[in-house]
Amino acid sequence: QGGAAEGVQIQIIYFNLETVQVTWNASKYSRTNLTFHYRFNGDEAYDQCTNYLLQEGHTSGCLLDAEQRDDILYFSIRNGTHPVFTASRWMVYYLKPSSPKHVRFSWHQDAVTVTCSDLSYGDLLYEVQYRSPFDTEWQSKQENTCNVTIEGLDAEKCYSFWVRVKAMEDVYGPDTYPSDWSEVTCWQRGEIRDACAETPTPPKPKLSK
């Protein structure tokens, strides 16, 4: 994500338009407490980070409260007074939406509608992945709102589902992060299950009259 300057690699994650995490990997300064200085306006004075991330006892990143700052982050990573990496970035291009909340399932015969609370901002995709023990890989369906209907399911099979949110690439670009997945939930015959058997259970023999 960040171009190397004096061997410094950076990563930016903007968590749900609320918190910005900037981390660095600087092999040349691996045993040094680098400091992080930032501002949200090009002509303001820099503030110093007050919430450092540590790795093996040394600073490796900074967490910033940036709720709805809708802006450019100007920052400088320094060794003492010497800047080792200075840059500025639109924060939105590093968006990581929050994980879906209040996920609900509504069954109707061979179809299920998965809903959750839409996030407060747009241009997102809500992706549902699902599989049964008979499937070799996850199937996927996504929509612009958290209202995803999956049809053609087999009512007798057990299905695992999970949901995540992604930023639309056309709008936010290729450097965003999908949200974490919601918890896996398992369903069979329209009822929630603790788990789906890893191996498909053989069909029960029909009882003779």
Epitope: G3, Q68, D70, D71, I72, D170, V171, G173, P174
Partner: antibody, heavy 125, light 106 residues
């Protein structure tokens, strides 16, 4: 359709002030940010900063603080650029432009799909 | 600042020619690059964004490519109405534009 209509050309003396307006139509004004850009005669384009039409929060690019003020009147879907203490080097065409993709809830991102027609400000004694 | 350098600064080509304009960023901007077309007396028009995505209503003879620091705008078959100044613009951070390429018909 989306339109940005700017006020007409201005001729001002050095030291005076000017206020350029940019009236938006065809969309919900507070949904997308407005940037201001300038183009000096025969020169390239320079981004001056932007204003969040939802919060009213202005952000100025380096070199455009002090004499330059962005403001809004959301009741008439209009953004304003005011320049004070005008200098000869402020002579330029000033454009307003709407952020094309990112909504004001999220912010701005520096891509300009919709532009005003431009306002020529001439500063001459 | 991220400096954007375009080349050539002007070029003359014949109708039907394939035309290429290049743009170089002073640092890695990934694919955060747009191309604009500006005709005399008009505001710029967005042609390309994300280095290669065509804007709405932009003819498919216009294409963009590149990532990192080196980018290209190509007009596959030049038409008379393509006479204009073309600008590249980065939006990795606060926007900066190239100095422009003036395209004329021979």
């Amino acid at each position: 359709q989306v339109q940005l209509v700017q006020s007409g050309a201005e001729v001002k003396k050095p030291g005076a002030s000017v206020k350029v307006s940019c009236k938006a139509s065809g969309y919900t004004f507070t949904t997308y940010g407005i940037s201001w850009l300038r183009q000096a005669p025969g020169q390239g384009l320079e981004w001056m900063g932007w204003v969040n039409t939802n919060t009213g929060n202005p952000r100025y690019a380096q070199g455009f603080t002090g004499r330059f003020v962005f403001s809004l009147d959301t009741s008439v879907s209009t953004a304003y650029l005011q320049i004070s203490s005008l200098k000869a080097e402020d002579t330029a065409v000033y454009y307003c432009a709407r952020e094309g993709f990112i909504t004001t809830v999220v912010g701005a991102a520096g891509r300009f799909v919709y532009w005003g027609q431009g306002t020529l400000v001439t500063v001459s004694s | 600042d991220i400096q954007m350098t375009q080349s050539p600064s002007s070029l003359s080509a014949s109708v039907g020619d394939r035309v290429t304009i290049t743009c170089r960023a002073s640092q890695d901007i990934h694919t955060r690059l747009a191309w604009y077309q500006q005709k005399p007396g008009q505001p710029p028009k967005l042609l390309i964004y994300w280095a290669s995505t065509r804007g709405s209503g932009v003819p498919d003879r216009f294409s963009g490519s590149g990532s990192g620091t080196d980018f290209t705008l190509t007009i596959s078959s030049l038409r008379a109405e393509d006479v204009a100044v073309y600008y590249c613009q980065q939006y990795s951070t606060y926007p900066t534009f190239g100095q422009g390429t003036k395209l004329e018909i021979k």
